[in-house]
Interface confidence: medium
């Protein structure tokens, strides 16, 4: 078992109201018909994506304001990789293959995206950060 994610001491997280009504396996949290896993160790963006895929998931695809707010709360002050990346000569793409449609602003000038409770930004993909996976309910 990878264990549960320990939120930083300076941040309090309340479980969303629908989190208990889920079809998610142990160590995963259900929200808005998706299962989420928040890592307890740090990896590069690519290694994190590989870790997600081993569980039939991808780095988190954020496709609604509710999801965004949920993940920012969950991430707290720590930086977490999510599934948005820009390959040279290509548009920003989510880890599910969808082109990003600029519905939120990504700061920074690097190629891989992370979030924390106050921002969504980009960083060099080789940096080791916590990460968030998601996949649809079974």
């Amino acid at each position: 078992s990878v264990g549960q994610y320990n939120c930083p001491g300076q941040y309090t997280f309340s479980m969303p109201s629908d989190s208990h009504v889920s079809s998610c396996s142990e160590d995963w949290v259900g929200y808005q018909r998706k299962c989420y896993f928040i890592s307890t160790v740090k990896r590069s963006w690519t290694s994190a994506q590989n870790a997600c895929s081993e569980h039939g998931a991808t780095l988190a695809v954020i496709d609604s304001e509710k999801d965004m707010n949920f993940l920012k709360r969950y991430a707290g002050r720590e930086e977490h990789w999510v599934g948005l990346k820009k390959e040279p000569g290509h548009p920003w793409k989510w880890s599910n293959g969808k082109e990003f449609n600029n519905w939120f602003n990504v700061t920074g000038s690097d190629k891989c995206v992370f979030l924390k409770n106050t921002e969504v930004s980009s960083m060099e993909c080789e940096k080791n950060l916590y990460w968030i996976c998601n996949k649809p309910y079974k």
């Epitope: 609604s64 082109e99 449609n101």
Partner: antibody, heavy 106, light 108 residues
Amino acid sequence: VQPGGSLRLSCAASGFTFSNFVMHWVRQAPGKGLEWVSSISGSSSSTYYADSVKGRFTISRDNSKNTLYLQMNSLRAEDTAVYYCARYYYASFDYWGQGTLVTVSS
Amino acid sequence: DIELTQPPSVSVAPGQTARISCSGDSLGSKYVYWYQQKPGQAPVVVIYGDSKRPSGIPERFSGSNSGNTATLTISGTQAEDEADYYCGSYTTGAKSHVFGGGTKLTVL
């Protein structure tokens, strides 16, 4: 307005934090389909235009007044349409203005 | 840039299922939204993000998108669903947006 003339449209927004959202103008010629016209980022740092209006129309916003603008110059008959302002969020234009009819004719 | 193609009209009997297609090159790699527009009114989004339904939109509206085709499905079509329907998406880099030509849905 007559061909070659100018006009400025405004769109007053309320009920949400205006500066946080990308805003767009979309138009619809009488009896025709929807046509995207222009967009502007929340901070006004990025603006984009359809080829059909590039160089003639200018989109802007005043976040202190929660207002979106479209300055239309060198108007043509084919610019005749109902112009809608619309908020863009996640993956759709989720809120639309009621529309303003602009008629360009001599 | 991407072009979206819709059938000009679709007819369906009340209670039956209506399907409206929207095709474009590699459309499945982008998110698609669908609007309903009734005469004299502004468009209303009925599906966004390929298949998500805004609150207040009846469950009979659903959407899908894969390959080169997105589809709006209205199950158990009602007379009030008679309207023009437009699909929409965005170009690479989301620097512009494009709409299909619209489909007039007639409930017989």
